[in-house]
Amino acid sequence: PLSPPTNLHLEANPDTGVLTVSWERSTTPDITGYRITTTPTNGQQGNSLEEVVHADQSSCTFDNLSPGLEYNVSVYTVKDDKESVPISDTIIPEVPQLTDLSFVDITDSSIGLRWTPLNSSTIIGYRITVVAAGEGIPIFEDFVDSSVGYYTVTGLEPGIDYDISVITLINGGESAPTTLTQQTAVPPPTDLRFTNIGPDTMRVTWAPPPSIDLTNFLVRYSPVKNEEDVAELSISPSDNAVVLTNLLPGTEYVVSVSSVYEQHESTPLRGRQKTGLDSPTGIDFSDITANSFTVHWIAPRATITGYRIRHHPEHFSGRPREDRVPHSRNSITLTNLTPGTEYVVSIVALNGREESPLLIGQQST
C-alpha cells in the first residue's frame, strides 16, 4: 500500500481567508503527487474544495473557505490510479477580527468608535457591546451593517471607564471581540465669573456640571505675563466659589477651573481678570510754611503711568485743586496755600484711565 503523508499542519489566516495545508512527504518512491480535499464536516453547507499537487510539493493553499465552519482536511498520496489512506485533521477558520478599532469624539456622555470594515463577503455586520467598569452584563448592545466603520455610543455617564467591544458577525458565527477601554470625559464647570476685584484679591465663581458626583474642583491661576508661576487650589465639590488672595496689583491673571472625578480632570474653563491698582502708601509732609508744604508718598507695587493729587481746605465744599505728576516722581510741593489752614490731600495712582483707591492725609500750613 502507498504510505500516506505525515505531520499534517493546517493554518488559516483570518485576515486573508487563506488556508495553508502542509505535510511531510510520503516515503513511497515514484509517486505521482498528492490530492488534498477540504470538506465541511457534519454536512454543513459550504464549499468542498480539492487540489492535486506535484510529488515534490509539500504544501498548498485554499481560498474562500467560510469562516466559522468546521472543515475536514485530508491529504492522500497518489500514484497512478492508486491512493493511500488519507492523513486528516479538522479546522475552523476564524472569523476575522477587527484590528484597527479606535476611539474618536469622546465627550462626557458619548464615545465614537472607528474601524476599517473588513473586506469579506461572508461578514454580515458587527455587534457593538458596552460594559461599564465594575459590571458584568453589557449595558448596551447594537448591530451595524458590514459596510459601516463608525459608530457613536451615546447615553453614557461622565467619568466612567467603559469596555467597548466590536465583534464581526457571519451567518452562524462570530469573531473574538476586539475590546478597548475608554473613559468618558469629565464635564467641565461653566459660567466663570469674577467679582469683588481688589488690588490683591478677586472672587471667582462657576457653575458645577450636572449629573456627576465630583471629587473636587481644581482652580489654577497665574499672571498672564508669567504663566509658569501657577498657583493651584483644590476646592470641595460642594463649593462653587473661591477668593484668590496675595495677588499682584494691576496684573492680568489667567484663571482656570477644572472638574475632577477620581484622578481625571475635565478640560479647563478659562477666564482672564485684572486686579485693581494698589494705592500709594506712607503719605508724609515736609517743608511746611505759611502758604506751602511738600507731600511725599511711597509708590504702589503696580505698574502705573502717574499720580493725581488733589487738595482742599478741610471744611471746604468747593472744587479741590488738582495736580498730576509722572510715575517717576513721589513728591510734590503744594503752593499758594492759605496760612494757618488744615488741608486734606488725596493721592491716586493712575494707569491710563484706571485709578487706585485714595491715599489721604491732612496737614496744616
Epitope: 452584563i137 453589557p138 448596551f140 447615553g155 453614557l156
Partner: antibody, heavy 117, light 108 residues
C-alpha cells in the same frame, strides 16, 4: 416575526432537577444574547440568567448561582436552563427573553415550574 | 444591587382618565438604561418604553415616559380598556438587571 417558545416546565420535588428549553425563530438567534426571567405566583419579575450570543459568557442571579446552568445551541436556535437542587422558592413562571442590553425586547409566553413535595 | 421602588402599588382609575406611575431607584440610573413593561394576566411582559422616554415599536402614543437620575415616570394620557394591566420598570445599568415590584392599574 420574533417568536420565543418555552417548554420543559412541570412539577418537581425539592432537590430535583428540570431542564427548560426555549425555541427561537424570526431573528438571527446566534447574534443575540438571551436571558431567563422568572415570576413567582402573584409576584414581580426577577432576572435569573443571561448568556452571550456565542455562549462564551454566562451570568447568574445570586439566588440561583451554582444550581442553574444556562446554555444555548445556535445550530438549533434553542436556549436552555438546567435547574438542579430545586427549592420551593424556585416555583415560578420562567420566561425566556431576548436580551438586547440594557433591555428585554421580546419575551416568550413562559413555562410554569412548580417545586413541591 | 439597584432597588427600584414603584408607586402606587395599585392605581384605580376609569377609562379616559390619566394614569401617572412612579419608579424610584435606590441610586442614580442614567435614563439610557431605564425601561417600562406592561403585563396583562396570563401573558408575558411586553416592552413599552426604553431609554426612559422612547416608545417601543407598535406602542400607542398615549404612553409616555420621563425622568432622570433616581425618579422616573410612566404616563398614560387617556386610559383605554386594554391598558388595565401591571406595569414594571427595569434598569439595565448595573448587574444584575432589576425590576420594580410593579404597579397594578385597575378599573375603578
Amino acid at each position: 416575526e420574533v417568536q420565543l417558545l418555552e417548554s420543559g416546565g412541570g412539577l418537581v420535588q425539592p432537590g430535583g432537577s428540570l431542564r427548560l428549553s426555549c425555541a427561537a425563530s424570526g431573528f438571527t438567534f446566534s447574534s443575540y444574547a438571551m436571558s431567563w426571567v422568572r415570576q413567582a405566583p402573584g409576584k414581580g419579575l426577577e432576572w435569573v440568567s443571561r448568556i452571550s450570543p456565542s455562549g462564551s459568557s454566562t451570568y447568574y442571579a445570586d439566588s440561583v448561582k451554582g444550581r442553574f446552568t444556562i446554555s444555548r445551541d445556535n445550530s438549533k436556535n434553542t436556549l436552555y436552563l438546567q435547574m438542579n437542587s430545586l427549592r420551593a422558592e424556585d416555583t415560578a413562571v420562567y420566561y425566556c427573553a431576548r436580551h438586547t442590553a440594557p433591555l428585554f425586547d421580546y419575551w416568550g409566553q413562559g413555562t410554569l415550574v412548580t417545586v413541591s413535595s | 444591587e439597584i432597588v427600584l421602588t414603584q408607586s402606587p402599588g395599585t392605581l384605580s382609575l376609569s377609562p379616559g382618565e390619566r394614569a401617572t406611575l412612579s419608579c424610584r431607584a435606590s441610586q442614580s440610573v442614567s435614563s439610557s438604561y431605564l425601561a417600562w413593561y406592561q403585563q396583562k394576566p396570563g401573558q408575558a411582559p411586553r416592552l413599552l418604553i426604553y431609554k426612559a422616554s422612547n416608545l417601543a415599536t407598535g406602542i400607542p402614543d398615549r404612553f409616555s415616559g420621563s425622568g432622570s437620575g433616581t425618579d422616573f415616570t410612566l404616563t398614560i394620557s387617556r386610559l383605554e380598556p386594554e391598558d388595565f394591566a401591571v406595569y414594571y420598570c427595569q434598569q439595565g445599568r448595573h448587574t444584575p438587571p432589576t425590576f420594580g415590584q410593579g404597579t397594578k392599574v385597575e378599573i375603578k
